[in-house]
């Protein structure tokens, strides 16, 4: 079965820094979402080879991509405290397949010592019933809620 390998599990970064999240699959994708989890899940990007990526307005101008949809590294720049949260990759194949999630902790520089990642993957605090066409459920964890998206159709 198709899987999504996602790394890192957790990262602690100061305000203004950057973070890399990598989503790797064995191929055969139509595209991949990076989603910030929470009571109101929030798409950050949708990436499909050969198509201009869709990026949420909150991250426009501070997202870079490298690689292809099968092995994609997403770099989020100039992180803000409100970017703290759990981000998961959703690969679109004939079913939905989810990564294990990346917990991003954005901290004030002086409080770096207070917030550290453990080695464990991020904990999903509440799991909804998985969509029937999904390889894994879409975990929900509390996070800062972003502004509503302003992404629209791609040609």
């Amino acid at each position: 079965a198709q899987e999504v390998q996602q790394s890192p599990h957790c990262t602690t970064v100061p305000v203004g820094a950057s973070v890399n999240i990598t989503c790797s699959t064995s191929g055969g994708l139509r595209g991949i979402y990076l989603r910030q989890l929470g009571p109101q899940p929030q798409d950050i990007i949708y990436y499909e080879d050969g198509v201009v990526p869709t990026t949420d307005r909150r991250f426009r101008g501070r997202i870079d991509f490298s690689g292809s949809q099968d092995n994609l590294t997403i770099t989020m720049h100039r992180l803000q405290l409100s970017d703290t949260g759990t981000y998961t990759c959703q690969a679109i194949t004939e079913v939905n397949v989810y990564g294990s999630g990346t917990l991003v902790l954005v901290t004030e520089e002086q409080s770096q010592g207070w917030h550290r990642c453990s080695d464990a993957p991020p904990r999903a605090s509440a799991l909804p019933a998985p969509p029937t066409g999904s390889a894994l459920p879409d975990p929900q964890t509390a996070s800062a809620l972003p502004d509503p998206p302003a992404a629209s159709a791609l040609p």
Epitope: R30, G31, Y33, R35, Q36, P39, Q40, P41, Q42, D43, I44, Y46, T54, D56, I92, T93, E94, V95, N96, P128, A129, P130, P131, T132, G133, S134, P137, D138, Q140, P148, P149, A151, S152, A153, L154
Partner: antibody, heavy 116, light 107 residues
């Protein structure tokens, strides 16, 4: 059992506006993408709009800039705001659960929109 | 946009018959093809997704096949409740597009 119930259809003049609603039950609404599909009087099916579970929206060129899809995860409701309506928008409008980016596995019974 | 064509707009068959409905795409769609059934009352149901996967609750007399640009839906043993219009739909690329439908009637 998953149920989708559309409402808000009616008769509207060209250039007018209408807002359709789709109430969902029996599913974890926030975990699913949702779509609107319409059926013309000639019985052709046309995809109208989609919204991913994370809020990205997608439209065909025929409605882009005139229609807006949105969702209220707290109330389990999907919306379609239609403006600058044209006679060619006359159709039965269905909402559907979008299981995997275009695979529409549950449909509502539809609501009729007439632009005349 | 990808155009979906169902060349047969209506089809008449007898109960118990094996019926095949065809659908072709204007370019390859990598098996991202669904089949829907619309009953005379307007109710729409998904029958087959990803070319050949039977949706839950759909009788096993329905099957799908195909690849590239050419796809088909087969009903192996026609029953009265199968009277409906059948639509194919591609979901390989936006915008999602549907065939014109094939109306199935009983002889």
């Amino acid at each position: 059992e998953v149920q989708l119930v559309e409402s808000g259809g009616g008769l509207v003049k060209p250039g007018g506006s209408l807002k359709l609603s789709c109430a969902a039950s029996g599913l974890t609404f926030s975990s699913y993408a949702m779509s609107w599909v319409r059926q013309t009087p000639e019985k052709r099916l046309e995809w109208v709009a989609s919204i991913s579970s994370g809020g990205f929206t997608y439209y065909p060129d025929s409605v882009k800039g005139r229609f807006t899809i949105s969702r209220d995860n707290a109330r389990n409701i999907l919306y379609l705001q239609m403006s600058s309506l044209r006679s060619e928008d006359t159709a039965m409008y269905y909402c559907a659960r979008d299981e995997v980016r275009g695979y529409l596995d549950v449909w509502g019974a539809g609501t009729t929109v007439t632009v005349s | 946009d990808i155009q979906m064509t169902q060349t047969t707009s209506s089809l008449s068959a007898s109960l118990g018959d094996r019926v095949t409905i065809s659908c072709s795409a204007s370019q390859g769609i990598s098996n991202y093809l669904n089949w829907y059934q619309q009953k005379p009352d307007g109710t729409v149901k998904l029958l087959i997704y990803y070319t050949s996967s039977l949706h839950s609750g759909v009788p096993s007399r329905f099957s799908g096949s195909g690849s590239g640009t050419d796809y088909s839906l087969t009903i192996s043993n026609l029953e009265p409740e199968d009277i409906a219009t059948y639509y194919c739909q591609q979901y390989s690329k936006l915008p999602y597009t549907f065939g014109g439908g094939t109306k199935l009637e009983i002889k």
